[in-house]
């Protein structure tokens, strides 16, 4: 199953993946890669990790800005592009036979909007934003931000409108989630 | 240049054993997967058998399973293909591959018969 | 494990045609396939992984397309040096598989 996030070209996009490192600090290899995840390792490499830290990056667009060390091997994309969009595999690589957990997770980039948003509020949505993704093969997939957000089938240009974005950002805050600003 | 040269072929009896190797160059063979696909006469690909970078990981094919070995010396950038109990069936060219889920370069093969 | 059919078998071609080849997955392999040309005493080539994108040095008229179950590999037009064995491979699922080929021959 795939949970699908939105990111406006020119801006960060924020696709989640983490493990718990057991016993903590015993840090497992991770990869992402562009496309499903396949049977091996990960195809067309964006970001790899080793036991200690990033060794491998095929552009310095892709980072790792959470809690490498706690297992968050979240993905950022910056100054994201229509070209960024697609399914990206987020491989945690256990050691043993086939023990690699893999996270698909698909990454939607839209145009700007036409209207200014307001300065304060950090147009980063693909944290704020999951969207539910249904398939054929796999039904719905669960979304990984916790809280009850606000339906997220709004047209693109509510979601840049001054007044929409100023009461959206109050529900964000009355469910919990965070609200990241410049 | 990425070159692949396979050897170790050559003509054995059902029951045999013959171990192949590949000679690597050109790349930084500690950092991919590799892999073994075999191509018997008039018939199509068939993937073998792969190993992970470290030689942790290494899977085969259900029909050679117990059968054949893969393993591979990184400071001799060489992989091998250890085949036991061999059988009319494992009749093919066998190349060596280097292995990203598709297999990006190809050694020119080695001819495995097997015959009485 | 995920059969790979290829059609059809054999194509017949003129010289400059296009050749449209397929390749069908018994179960959903996504984008993660590849495709290979096999010419008679040479190593398999890689043509296309990803489904749709072309390795290094391929030439502009091999193309790729489909995901899921059906996938096509088109040669736009056809030169000399293209009449081949083409092969269709997933790396979805385990284990890797390949479908049979399809022989592009001159018409």
């Known amino acids: 199953s795939e949970v699908e996030y939105i990111a406006e070209v020119g801006q960060n996009a924020y696709l989640p993946c983490s493990y718990t490192p057991a016993p903590p600090g015993n840090l497992v290899p991770v990869c992402w890669g562009k496309g499903a995840c396949p049977v091996f390792d990960c195809s067309n490499v964006v970001l790899r990790t080793d036991n200690r830290d990033v060794n491998d990056r095929t552009s310095g667009r892709y980072w790792l800005k959470g809690d490498f060390h706690k297992g968050d091997v979240s993905l950022t994309i910056e100054n994201v592009t229509l070209a960024d969009s697609g399914v990206y595999c987020c491989r945690i690589q256990i050691p043993g036979i086939m023990n690699d957990e893999k996270h698909n997770v698909k990454l939607v980039v839209i145009k700007p909007a036409k209207v200014t948003p307001a300065p304060t509020l950090q147009r980063d949505l693909t944290s704020a934003f999951p969207r539910m993704l249904t398939t054929g093969e796999h039904g719905p997939a669960e979304t990984q931000t916790p809280g009850s957000l606000p339906d997220v089938n709004l047209t693109v240009s509510n979601f840049f409108c001054e007044l929409q974005i100023f009461t959206l950002t109050n529900e964000l805050r009355d469910s919990g989630a965070t609200i990241r600003t410049a | 240049e990425v070159q692949l040269v396979e050897s170790g072929g050559g003509l054995v009896q059902p029951g045999g054993s013959l171990r192949l190797s590949c000679a690597a160059s050109?790349?930084?063979?500690?950092?991919?997967?590799m892999s073994w696909v075999r191509q018997a006469p008039g018939k199509g690909l068939e993937w073998v058998a792969n190993i992970k970078q470290d030689g942790s990981e290494k899977y085969y094919v259900d029909s050679v399973k117990g059968r054949f070995t893969i393993s591979r010396d990184s400071a001799k950038n060489s992989l091998y293909l250890q085949m036991n109990s061999l059988r009319a069936e494992d009749t093919a060219m066998y190349f060596c591959?280097?292995?990203?889920?598709?297999?990006?370069?190809w050694g020119q093969g080695t001819l495995v018969t097997v015959s009485s | 494990e995920t059969v790979m059919t290829q059609s059809p078998a054999t194509l017949s071609v003129s010289p400059g045609e296009r050749a449209t080849l397929s390749c069908r997955a018994s179960?959903?392999?996504?984008?993660?396939l590849a495709w290979y040309q096999r010419k008679p005493g040479q190593a398999p080539r890689l043509l296309i992984y990803?489904?749709?994108t072309r390795a290094t040095g391929i030439p502009a008229r091999f193309s790729g397309s489909g995901s899921g179950t059906e996938f096509t590999l088109t040669i736009s037009s056809l030169q000399s040096e293209d009449f081949a064995v083409y092969y269709c491979q997933q790396y979805n699922n385990w284990p890797l598989t390949f479908g049979g080929g399809t022989k592009v021959e001159i018409k």
């Open positions: 179960q959903s392999v996504s984008s993660n």
């Open positions: 050109g790349f930084t063979f500690s950092s991919y997967w």
């Open positions: 591959a280097r292995d990203s889920n598709f297999f990006d370069y």
């Open positions: 990803f489904s749709s």
